[in-house]
């Protein structure tokens, strides 16, 4: 970037720079056309009569240097060849020179400082690459110079510029003095304010743009060269905070739009809210759950938020005795999460309706929580009792919801208990067509025995088919029309109210070979 | 502000010559263009030539070749026109006319002429 | 010589119109053209040089656009002192030559 010093180009009064020695021949300020066909100020010398070795100085007004340690001065020049020149002395030039004065004010005067080198530093001789020329019979035609100096370091408050003819023919047209500095920066989110460089190179620290941290240390810099360049080289070290993302090409931190959101420092983009969540405000960090809807603790930020799970479905149970099957569906809804389980919560109802949490000498397997197979079974259930058993799905989320979680209900009543197994068979009697049996009464738990069912069958012959039964009202029964000393297998179970009890342990009786032994009494 | 200040009226004998002056006061002279234009009576302007004084040669229009002389004297910062063989046609006021800018300080030469002297008034008759 | 072509010759019009003046030139000229006023007895005044450029201290009702062989010069309103004689002038060549003049008279 160049910041302008003084551009005579831009100014519309009279320049009145300061001309010596005062005499004939001096430059002089002149209205001038420039390329864009713009009036100008200039000033022209072309004394062809002077005596020789008389100087003609040209001095600018004082220019504050702002900082400036470096001023450059281009200036476009005209100049006539001293060869189209008729009545041009061996003394003509093609050239002039550039000198400089430092002071802290403007305190130059018409006389001072003494007009030479010394005090004033000589920049440059600058020689036209055109010159003007007029060829007979022809117009003259020429060219504008443009010539770039270089001045300083400079280091007082501000400087003149001062132009020496010593026998060119020639016009300023227009003088442009200026610095080079690096404009203001921002690039990769970090920002490098303008930098006049003071010498070849100069290292600028930056900042951090609105709403992004740094991410490194030491803070980011950059070099600003004399060139007023910045120098090439990768910035890193800011990043934009959570909330925010970078935007138009990394040089601002934009705040994340509703309904989007961004969870940690990076370069990452703002992202839309996950499922079930929302952000009503621009710059979210995080997406708020819509009600009803949770984060577990473990959650990342950028997961979807979830609810409990709807009820299981469809309980059925499977009664055995003293042990019950419980299964059931999947729930309709699994609340949008992975680690669904079921747990299982027995209560035990009287008639009149109280209910009481079930006894301790009941044992779920695999166990009453935390299942992740939709089954358990329970065993030590007492016989002509209501148990209601509510099957609940629960994942990561229940424990925030507000409420009990969804069950799905399941009454079982369990039945009155049967009468223990009949065993202690005794043959009374046997023929070779027929056994007598007997056998001890049971205990019935639940009323008296109503009666007994027999269940035999040739030992070796154990098909559906072969297997006969026999009920009886006593304690005893004759089995008839068997096989002449054949063996058989025997099991009896008896029935009350409460239905029929387990069959006992198979007896092994044997029918008599011939009629002689028939009724033969015998014991088992 | 320049003035260009010019010789005064003249009459003349037809065949005989005519030197009009043109003095410019204050500052630059040798780098601008002096034009010279004649006017008739009732009739439009016609361009006779020109000289940038440096150079000291000059341009001339044609129809006034090999009769029109154009000088400049740097050291007086005047220009002159002489004509000569003069008819009854050329009886008009004579101008003098500078250039708006120097040679030196235009980047196009539009050699527009914003100065004009008073006119000189030549009157060729018998 | 290039020829300069001015028209119309003369022209009557009333203060406040539009007046525009045309010069033809007889080749190229780029916009090497210049625009003069002139009063009786009086020198002629510069109004436009590089076909557009208006002349410092010129009123800006003057206006003058062109480039090649055809250039306009217009008054955009007119007032009672722009009543007077508007030539063009040429100076592309090393020989300038000016048209023959536009006399604008009050109707």
């Known amino acids: 970037l160049e910041e302008t010093l003084l551009n005579t180009k831009l100014e519309t009064a009279d320049l009145k720079w300061v001309t010596y020695p005062q005499a004939e021949g001096q430059w002089e300020e002149l209205s001038g056309l420039d390329e864009e066909q713009h009036s100008v100020r200039t000033y022209e010398v072309c004394d062809m009569k002077r005596p020789g070795g008389q100087a003609h100085w040209l001095r600018t007004g004082w220019v504050p240097r702002r900082g400036a340690v470096h001023v450059y001065a281009t200036i476009r020049f005209t100049m006539m060849e001293c060869l189209s020149l008729p009545r041009a002395s061996r003394s003509c030039k093609e050239t002039f020179t550039v000198f400089y004065y430092e002071s802290e004010a403007d305190t130059a005067t018409a006389h001072t400082p003494a007009w030479m080198e010394n005090p004033y530093i000589k920049v440059d001789t600058v020689a036209a690459e055109h010159l003007t020329r007029k060829r007979p019979g022809a117009e003259a035609t020429g060219k504008v110079n443009i010539k770039t100096l270089r001045l300083g370091p400079l280091s007082k408050a501000g400087f003149y510029l001062a132009f020496q003819d010593q026998g060119a023919c020639m016009a300023l047209l227009s003088l442009h003095l200026f610095y080079k500095k690096c404009s203001w920066l921002i690039t990769n989110l970090t920002y490098f304010p303008e930098t006049v460089p003071r010498e070849l190179v100069v290292p600028v620290a930056g900042s951090c743009v609105a709403n992004a941290v740094p991410t490194a240390n030491p803070s980011p810099s950059l070099y600003c060269r004399e060139d007023g360049q910045w120098a090439e080289q990768q910035v890193t070290g800011c990043s934009c905070a959570p909330g925010y993302e970078a935007a138009e090409s990394n040089k601002v931190c934009r705040a994340c739009g509703q309904g989007t959101f961004k969870p940690q420092i990076g370069d990452e983009s703002c992202l839309p809210c996950p499922a079930n969540s929302h952000s009503n405000n621009i710059g979210s960090p995080v997406c708020l759950c819509r009600i009803g809807y949770y984060r577990a603790r473990s959650d990342p930020r950028s997961s979807p938020c979830t609810t409990p799970p709807s009820a299981p479905r469809s309980v059925v149970h499977h009664l055995n005795g003293s042990t019950l099957r419980l299964e059931w569906s999947a729930p309709l809804e699994s609340g949008g999460r992975e680690d669904l389980t079921y747990a299982v919560r027995c209560r035990e109802c009287r008639p009149g309706g109280s209910c009481l949490p079930c006894g301790g000498d009941m044992t779920f397997d695999p166990g009453p929580r935390d299942l992740v197979e939709p089954w358990v079974a329970i065993r030590g259930l007492r016989p002509d009792v209501t148990y209601t058993f509510e099957v609940a799905a629960l994942n990561g989320v229940s424990t925030l919801a507000t409420g009990p979680p969804p069950f799905e209900p399941v009454n079982v009543t369990t039945d009155r208990e049967v009468p223990p197994a009949v065993s202690d068979i005794r043959v009374t009697r046997s023929s070779p067509s027929s056994l007598i049996l007997s056998w001890a009464i049971p205990r019935a738990p639940s009323g008296a025995v109503l009666d007994y069912e027999v269940k035999y069958h040739e030992k070796g012959a154990e098909g559906p088919s072969s297997v006969r039964f026999l009920k009886t009202s006593e304690n005893r029964a004759e089995l008839r029309g068997l096989k002449r000393g054949a063996s058989y297998l025997v099991q009896v179970r008896a029935r009350s109210e409460a239905g029929y009890g387990p069959f006992g342990q198979e007896h092994h009786s044997q029918t008599q070979l011939d009629e002689s032994e028939s009724w033969r009494e015998q014991l088992a | 502000q320049v003035q260009l200040v010019q010789s005064g009226a003249e009459v003349k004998k037809p065949g005989s010559s005519v030197k009009v002056s043109c003095k410019a006061s204050?500052?630059?002279?040798?780098?601008?263009?002096i034009s010279w234009v004649r006017q008739a009576p009732g009739q439009g302007l016609e361009w006779m030539g020109r000289?940038?004084?440096?150079?000291?040669?000059?341009n001339y229009a044609q129809k006034f070749q090999g009769r029109v002389t154009i000088t400049a004297d740097e050291s007086t910062s005047t220009a002159y026109m002489e004509l000569s063989s003069l008819r009854s046609e050329d009886t008009a006021v004579y101008y003098c006319?500078?250039?708006?800018?120097?040679?030196?300080?235009?980047?196009?030469?539009?050699?527009?002429?914003?100065?004009w002297g008073q006119g000189t008034l030549v009157t060729v008759s018998s | 010589d290039i020829q300069m072509t001015q028209s119309p010759s003369s022209l009557s019009a009333s203060v406040g119109d539009r007046v525009t003046i045309t010069c033809r030139a007889s080749?190229?000229?780029?916009?090497?053209l210049n625009w003069y006023q002139q009063k009786p007895g009086k020198a002629p005044k510069l109004l436009i040089y590089?076909?557009?450029i208006l002349q410092s201290g010129v009123p800006s009702r003057f206006s003058g656009s062109g480039s090649g062989t055809d250039f306009t010069l217009t008054i955009s309103s007119l007032q009672p002192e722009d009543f007077a004689v508007y030539y063009c002038?040429?100076?592309?060549?090393?020989?300038?030559?000016f048209g023959q003049g536009t006399k604008v008279e009050i109707k």
């Open positions: 000289i940038i004084p440096i150079f000291g040669t000059a």
């Open positions: 006319a500078r250039s708006s800018y120097t040679i030196l300080t235009t980047y196009y030469n539009y050699n527009a002429m914003d100065n």
């Open positions: 590089g076909s557009s």
């Open positions: 204050g500052g630059t002279f040798s780098t601008y263009a």
């Open positions: 080749q190229n000229i780029n916009n090497f």
């Open positions: 002038h040429q100076v592309s060549d090393t020989s300038d030559t």
